[in-house]
């Protein structure tokens, strides 16, 4: 009778095991082991026992001991069960961003692992088991469907294999896949709201605001603002589930014309976009041209107003005749025209909007000097010892220099408060002088003596 020890073995893949073949007869003619495995007989003493080291056991095997005794041949099998953990445990790749409300299918693939009867595949969200199934097929595949919720955001999904050899006196061997981190999002169907000027003048700055409500997670939303090919750099302010992106836009003559302003919001693997047109225009202020900005009294002056070819102008409130980009008027310069403003207003229609521009020029009229009775009375009579202020105003442009002298030397203190004395009495020659010439006027000061009672 042939016997084998151990009769059952569980060992790691590639491992070794000692198998003893024994026979009940004292003098077996033959005693050995039948196996395709590499074997080493340990050459131990004794006729009725042989010990073999079987090595590099890669798969389940059933080595057979045999002996040939006088009473016949017999055999005995030992059952070698190889265990090994899976070589590959992985979740099928998925986009990391998933919209809330979508059904997400998690698929775990397991390659290898034995014995399969002891191998289980578990799908998990965090530490919560979603599904547990035995490993079947090669590769084994386990799937489950998850309805994506807001609170799944940032959750880790993974797949774990459990090779449970505790019933065989070994341990529980676990292998876990790389985690799949789910990013959930909500991007509303409504496009973002875009507020911007419809028209924008060359070499000026405008403000663009793009906003959207109902986003999750709002901090992950990307906002792209662009005017034509020009990417804008917005400052983004976040609310609980909304954002507002504000950007300054500067335009140059190269941008003139109709440009597309876009605001795109990207969240997860979806986007929403709003398009708007902005008309970039060039409209310099109208030009007011005076024949000469400074003329002498009585000179003929031409005032011209010129504006953008498509503009319509009014000069000092009078529309151009015919209505168009040019207007002019003629005048003879009078002292009253000195400091007179000539205002040209131009109006241009851009994308249905009326744009107004003004330009003003001032005319300077040179005249004088003048000394007249109203502003420089010819006769003053003042009581002696009274306080008086001699007044004499010379007119002209440029403003004349005024001096009043008695006997060519004694000055009358114009505009100053003085105590009237006898010395003040007399006739003064007031001389007003400017680049335009000079005029004189006699001013007499009479001093009344007090009556003595």
């Amino acid at each position: 009778q042939t016997s084998v020890s151990p009769s059952k073995v569980i060992l790691p893949r590639g491992g070794s095991v000692l198998v003893t073949c024994s026979t009940s007869c004292d003098q077996p003619k033959l005693l050995g082991i039948e196996t395709p495995l590499p074997k080493k007989e340990l050459l131990l003493p004794g006729n009725n026992r042989k010990v073999y080291e079987l090595s590099n056991v890669q798969e389940d095997s059933q080595p057979m001991c045999y002996s040939n005794c006088p009473d016949g041949q017999s055999t005995a099998k030992t059952f070698l069960t190889v265990y090994w953990t899976p070589e590959r445990v992985e979740l099928a790749p998925l986009p990391s961003w998933q919209p809330v409300g979508k059904n997400l299918t998690l698929r775990c693939q397991v390659e290898g692992g034995a014995p399969r009867a002891n191998l289980t595949v578990v799908l998990l969200r965090g530490e919560k088991e979603l599904k547990r199934e035995p490993a079947v097929g090669e590769p084994a595949e386990v799937t489950t469907t998850v309805l994506v919720r807001r609170d799944h955001h940032g959750a880790n999904f993974s797949c774990r294999t459990e090779l449970d050899l505790r019933p065989q006196g070994l341990e529980l061997f676990e292998n876990t896949s790389a985690p799949y981190q789910l990013q959930t999002f909500v991007l509303p169907a409504t496009p973002p709201q875009l507020v911007s000027p419809r028209v924008l003048e060359v070499d000026t700055q405008g403000t663009v605001v793009c906003s959207l409500d109902g986003l999750f997670p709002v901090s992950e939303a990307q906002v792209h603002l662009a005017l034509g090919d020009q990417r804008l750099n917005p400052t983004v302010t976040y609310g609980n589930d909304s954002f507002s992106a504000k950007a300054s836009v500067s335009v140059t003559a190269e941008d003139e014309g109709t440009q597309r302003l876009t605001c795109a919001v990207i969240l997860g693997n979806q986007s929403q976009e709003t398009l708007q047109t902005v008309t970039i225009y060039s409209f310099p202020a109208p030009n007011v041209i005076l024949t000469k900005p400074e003329v002498s009294e009585g000179t003929e002056v031409t005032v011209k107003c010129e504006a953008h070819p498509r503009a319509k102008v009014t000069l000092n409130g009078v529309p151009a005749q015919p209505l168009g980009p040019r207007a002019q008027l003629l005048l003879k310069a009078t002292p009253e025209d000195n400091g007179r403003s000539f205002s040209c207003s131009a109006t241009l229609e851009v994308a249905g909007q009326l744009i107004h521009k003004n330009q003003t020029r001032e005319l300077r009229v040179l005249y004088g000097p003048r000394l007249d009775e109203r502003d420089c009375p010819g006769n003053w009579t003042w009581p002696e010892n009274s306080q008086q202020t001699p007044m004499c105003q010379a007119w002209g442009n440029p403003l004349p220099e005024l001096k009043c002298l008695k006997d060519g030397t004694f000055p009358l203190p114009i505009g100053e408060s003085v105590t009237v004395t006898r010395d003040l009495e007399g006739t003064y020659l007031c001389r007003a002088r400017s680049t335009q010439g000079e005029v004189t006027r006699k001013v007499t000061v009479n001093v009344l003596s007090p009556r003595y009672e």
Epitope: Q27, P28, K29, L30, L31, G32, I33, E34, T35, P38, K39, K40, E41, L42, L43, L44, P45, G46, N47, S55, Y66
Partner: antibody, heavy 122, light 109 residues
């Protein structure tokens, strides 16, 4: 094919050391016992000892225990027979032989080397 | 220790049958292997496990084993069969030993 190739003939003086070799090819060298057999001039075969190259497990004949050392280097599939101090009586032909692999037993030497002649003379 | 006894020489005419014996205590309970060694050559296994012939060995070689004697029989002997023949067993009493017989010189007349 399975082959055992031994090193060439040696002529030595008494007291000298010697190592002869046996290189296996055509099979998994580590998985079979290699035995050494002496044949003195005009005499029969004498078993000296045996080694398992996989782990260098060794058994010696009582007649040769302490007289020779059997070793192996599995990285180069070679077994060795060595003496630390030769005597004239060590003059002989030495054979290495691979112990069998038959599934119905493994007791015979089924493959032999060509032999190495060792001459010890002063 | 276990001992194997062989006749030192056996002579036979070509074409005849040669019989070489190997004696040992209760040798029939052991497996016996036979080796042929031609002059100047290494031994070659010709019979193992009493009567099995390795591949490449002619059918003229056969073996048997019972009681206290194992026998190697060579039928229709040829000149090329002239060689020394050795029997071998393993002895596992109190250890592991390989035992060779003293050898038999077969002469083809």
């Amino acid at each position: 094919q399975v082959q055992l190739v031994q090193s060439g003939a040696e002529v030595k003086k008494p007291g000298e050391s010697l190592r002869i070799s046996c290189k296996g090819s055509g099979y998994s060298f580590t998985n079979y016992w290699i035995g050494w057999v002496r044949q003195m001039p005009g005499k029969g075969l004498e078993w000296m000892g045996i080694i398992y190259p996989g782990d260098s497990d060794t058994r010696y004949s009582p007649s040769f225990q302490g007289q020779v050392t059997i070793a192996a280097d599995k990285s180069i599939s070679t077994a060795y027979l060595q003496w630390s101090s030769l005597m004239a009586s060590d003059t002989a032909m030495y054979y290495c032989a691979r112990r069998g692999s038959r599934s119905s037993g493994e007791d015979a030497f089924e493959v032999w080397g060509q032999g190495t002649t060792v001459t010890v003379s002063s | 220790s276990y001992e194997l006894t062989q006749p030192p020489s056996v002579s036979v005419a070509p074409g005849k049958t040669a019989t070489i014996t190997c004696g040992g205590d209760n040798i029939g309970s052991k497996s016996v292997h036979w080796y042929q060694q031609r002059p100047g050559q290494a031994p070659v296994l010709v019979i193992n496990y009493d009567s099995d012939r390795p591949s490449g060995i002619p059918e003229r070689f056969s073996g048997s084993n019972s009681g206290n004697t194992a026998t190697l029989t060579i039928s229709r002997v040829e000149a090329g069969d002239e060689a020394d023949y050795y029997c071998q067993v393993e002895d596992r009493r109190g250890g592991y030993h390989v035992v060779f017989g003293g050898g038999t010189k077969l002469t083809v007349l």
